[in-house]
Structure formats: structure tokens, C-alpha cells
């Protein structure tokens, strides 16, 4: 009778992460008597995946009933595959021995490769706000994909960006990979409604590329422009002076009126109007009693926007 052979018909198997891998193995004879074991890798450091005789292997099921006397099919299924399961799996026949079973013959091995989708890209912007004309950096990260080949693109409002640097790690062979990219974006005054998008494409993605977004409203600070104007006299001895605070973002703003350097009133922007570009306008007025002043009055509108140093605009009120 011919000596038992262990047949692993599949040289290689490709499985998607999360799915079940079937590793096929048959023996050509029932003799010698003894169990089958599955290992990942060869040599002394090999990892036991399944032992027919003993042990608990919750992710492994056998394709056929190994308790049947005439069974020669030793194929297994491994559930919920992850990239970490990649490697070469060997079906090994043992001969019954005392006290221990003795390794008799091994199959040629089946290489299990795993394809895994990239995680949803996460885009993060700078910790502090920046003003128009400044260049800010955005990072995009995605993890856990295999194989290594991946494309990453950056867009601002649908226009592709070119100033970015991308790294895929690790550089050498690995079960899965990560991508990290940093893009530089020049802010403009119109960017309150703008979005920066990181787009990742990979062989495993059946839909469109995965996208991560960042709203520039969380990054930009548009400082206000101030204009102080004197309105016609409203009533006897009263002058209305207005301070127009235009095109600012975000809304957080405090305004202080000074009369000849002395604080007259402080208020916080509340009923603002929003511009089409997402910036805000606000107006504050001060009624000045001219009769209370002998000399000309210097009125100052002082604005502290989003915790930044105050900006101010003055107006000289003539007392005739």
C-alpha cells in the first residue's frame, strides 16, 4: 500500500477581513492511525491553529466530521479573519505514539493572504485658529488596510490640492498598513464655508473612495473691519455715533466705547447679521450728550474679537 500523503490543493488563498477562510487538506490513506494538527508557519516557532485530539479553538471549525472512522478530509474553516491571520498554514499528520504522537507527514502549505479595507479617513486641522493669507496644515490618517497600495488625494471645495506629503507605514512587509498625509492650505477671507477633504481609494472599496472632511470654519478667524460714523443730531444736544463691525468670524466679539479714553459702555455681540460668505456684521451705537462736554470729544470704538488683542477706531466729535 502506498504511503500516506497530505494534500493541500491550494497553494494560496485570498480572503477579505471579517470573512471565513477555508483551508483544504486531505490524506490519501487512513494509515497510520493518528491525529491531524494545523500550524501557521514551520519550524520550532510554529503556531498551533487546530489540534484534532485536544484543545479549544473557538475560531476554527472542521469542514467534515473528523470523528468518523473513514474520514480523510481534514479541511478547516477559520472565522472572522483579520490581517494578523496572514501566513502559511500547514496540515500535519501525526502517527499515534507513546507517550507522545510523532509527526509523520506535512502538507506543502497554503499561504493565506488577507485583504482589508482602510478605516474611514480622519482629518484634523490646527489647534489654533489662523487668519486669511496664512498657511495652515491638515492631517489625514487611515489605518488597517491591506494590500499596501493606496491612493490619497486632497481637495478644497472640490479643487484638488497639490501641496501635501504622504507616508504609508510600515515601509517593509506587514500584515496591514496605515497612511498619514499632511496638506498645506492657504486661507482666504471667503473660507468660512470651505471644506478640506481627504479622499482615500483602495482595491477593497466597492463604493467611491472614502472621504474625511474638515470644515475651515473651525480653523479660520476673519478679523473685523471697523468704521465709526457720526449720525445727524437726534435731539437737542444729543449725537448718535455708530461703530460698524464688518466681516468677522467667529461670532465671539466684545465692543467697548471710550469717551476721551474713559470706558463708557461695554457690550457683547448678540444680534449679528450673517453675510453670504459666512462672516458676520454687527453695529453698535452710542448717544453722546454734547452739553456735558466743554471741549471736543474723542470717541473710540474698541473691539476684542475671539480673544485677540483689541483693535480700535476713533472719531473726533466737534463740540461747537
Amino acid at each position: 500500500e502506498e504511503e500516506l500523503q497530505v494534500i493541500q490543493p491550494d497553494k494560496s488563498v485570498l480572503v477579505a477581513a471579517g470573512e471565513t477562510a477555508t483551508l483544504r487538506c486531505t490524506a490519501t490513506s487512513l494509515i497510520p492511525v493518528g491525529p491531524i494538527q494545523w500550524f501557521r508557519g514551520a519550524g520550532p516557532g510554529r503556531e498551533l491553529i487546530y489540534n484534532q485530539k485536544e484543545g479549544h479553538f473557538p475560531r476554527v471549525t472542521t469542514v467534515s466530521d473528523l470523528t468518523k472512522r473513514n474520514n480523510m478530509d481534514f479541511s478547516i474553516r477559520i472565522g472572522n479573519i483579520t490581517p494578523a491571520d496572514a501566513g502559511t498554514y500547514y496540515c500535519v499528520k501525526f502517527r499515534k505514539g507513546s507517550p507522545d504522537d510523532v509527526e509523520f507527514k506535512s502538507g506543502a502549505g497554503t499561504e493565506l493572504s488577507v485583504r482589508a479595507k482602510p478605516s474611514a479617513p480622519v482629518v484634523s486641522g490646527p489647534a489654533a485658529r489662523a487668519t486669511p493669507q496664512h498657511t495652515v496644515s491638515f492631517t489625514c490618517e487611515s489605518h488597517g488596510f491591506s494590500p499596501r497600495d493606496i491612493t490619497l488625494k486632497w481637495f478644497k471645495n472640490g479643487n484638488e490640492l497639490s501641496d501635501f506629503q504622504t507616508n504609508v507605514d510600515p515601509v517593509g512587509e506587514s500584515v496591514s498598513y496605515s497612511i498619514h498625509s499632511t496638506a498645506k492650505v492657504v486661507l482666504t477671507r471667503e473660507d468660512v464655508h470651505s471644506q478640506v477633504i481627504c479622499e482615500v481609494a483602495h482595491v477593497t472599496l466597492q463604493g467611491d473612495p472614502l472621504r474625511g472632511t474638515a470644515n475651515l470654519s473651525e480653523t479660520i478667524r476673519v478679523p473685523p473691519t471697523l468704521e465709526v460714523t457720526q449720525q445727524p443730531v437726534r435731539a437737542e444736544n444729543q449725537v448718535n455715533v455708530t461703530c460698524q463691525v464688518r466681516k468677522f468670524y467667529p461670532q465671539r466679539l466684545q465692543l467697548t466705547w471710550l469717551e476721551n479714553g474713559n470706558v463708557s459702555r461695554t457690550e457683547t455681540a448678540s444680534t449679528v447679521t450673517e453675510n453670504k460668505d459666512g462672516t458676520y456684521n454687527w453695529m453698535s451705537w452710542l448717544l453722546v450728550n454734547v452739553s456735558a462736554h466743554r471741549d471736543d470729544v474723542k470717541l473710540t470704538c474698541q473691539v476684542e474679537h475671539d480673544g485677540q488683542p483689541a483693535v480700535s477706531k476713533s472719531h473726533d466729535l466737534k463740540v461747537s
Epitope: 485570498l14 477579505a16 493572504s113 477593497t204 472599496l205 466597492q206 463604493g207
Partner: antibody, heavy 116, light 109 residues
Framework: VQLVESGGRLGQPGTSLTLSCTVS????????MGWFRQAPGKGLEYIGI?????SPYYASWVNGRFTISKTSTTMDLKMNSLRSEDTATYFC?????????????WGPGTLVTVSS | DIQMTQSPSSLSASVGDRVTITCRAS??????LAWYQQKPGKAPKLLIY???FLYSGVPSRFSGSGSGTDFTLTISSLQPEDFATYYC???????????FGQGTKVEIK
Amino acid sequence: VQLVESGGRLGQPGTSLTLSCTVSGFSLSSYVMGWFRQAPGKGLEYIGIISSSGSPYYASWVNGRFTISKTSTTMDLKMNSLRSEDTATYFCARVGPLGVDYFNIWGPGTLVTVSS
Amino acid sequence: DIQMTQSPSSLSASVGDRVTITCRASQSINSYLAWYQQKPGKAPKLLIYSASFLYSGVPSRFSGSGSGTDFTLTISSLQPEDFATYYCQSWHYISRSYTFGQGTKVEIK
């Protein structure tokens, strides 16, 4: 799992024609689908794909003359300004479950003949 | 666009012969290569994907190898039902586009 193309016929140069690919046994919202063609006695040529979410992508030679769209159970190929060189068998195919780099299920094809 | 050059364009062989078909890409496509078999009047059938993985139900006499730019389809022992035309197909992960080789017709000697 099955794909069947329909709509192939004799068409006049300069006219339009829409081919359909009807699928059964799986959902079009889960897979990338593709259109290919093969002129008589020639090799296979890629036309374009439509993603599971409905975005079309085309071969560089298409130049806006063909449009791929889909509903829940059919994928369409609209061909405008037909030319004699569009005479071919048109195939639809589904990409494999492991990735978009290969096509594991193909329809039998539908013949389009462009002639005056 | 990537060009795929298949060779030979045709070959004559006998049942039982070992047959090798090669496919060369104009630039690296890593392992994104598939092989199809097509018979006259029929749709292509997938044989090999990702350069070396045998598609379900395909006889084990078919095998694929290669990566980068050079790929091979081997039929270890040609059977009567294997007389057909074979195509390689690449996928480029950057352009996300597909290209076919011009085909290899395997005929009976």
C-alpha cells in the same frame, strides 16, 4: 447570481442606443459593475464602471460619448453618436467580492451592429 | 494608460502539453492581474485573480505567477476543453483603470 444584457440591435450611425444589464442574486448597491465590448474577431476592451454608490468612471477613450447609470436592479449603458467602429458584443460584468481588480461574473453579451 | 502585451498571440499544442502564456505591463501593476478564458460566442470566464489565486471551480492545472510587470499563466497538462483564447487584464491602483492584453489563441496541433 446572474447578469443578462439586453438592448443590442442594428443602429444607424449618429443615433443613440441604450443597453441594459439586469442582475439577479445580488444587490447592485454592494458591488462595482463594469461594461466591456469586443469587436468581431478582436480582443476585449474596457468601457467603464459604476461604483456601488452610483458614481461612473470611464476609460480615457470614451470622451463623454457613453454614459453609465443604474437603478436598483439594472445597469445601463447609453451610447450616443454611434459609429461603425462601435459594432461589437457588449458585456456587463461584476467585480469580485475581494476587490475591484478583477471581474468574476459576466453576462452572455448583447450584439450591437452600427450600419447604414 | 498602461499597455498590456501578451505573448504569443497564438500557439498550437497537443492534449497533455504544458502551456505557458506571458503578459507584460508597460509599468508596474504590483499583483493586480487577472486571467480569463474565452470560447467563441461566449463570455469570458475568470481563471486567476490577483496574479496567482485560482478562482473557485477552476481546475488546478491552471496556475498564475508574477508581480510588477511580468506575469505568466501556465496550464500544466492541456485538456481538450482548454482550447480557447486567453486574456490577461490589469488594474492600476492609481488611475483605477483596466487594460486587457490582446489575447492568446490556444489551438489544437
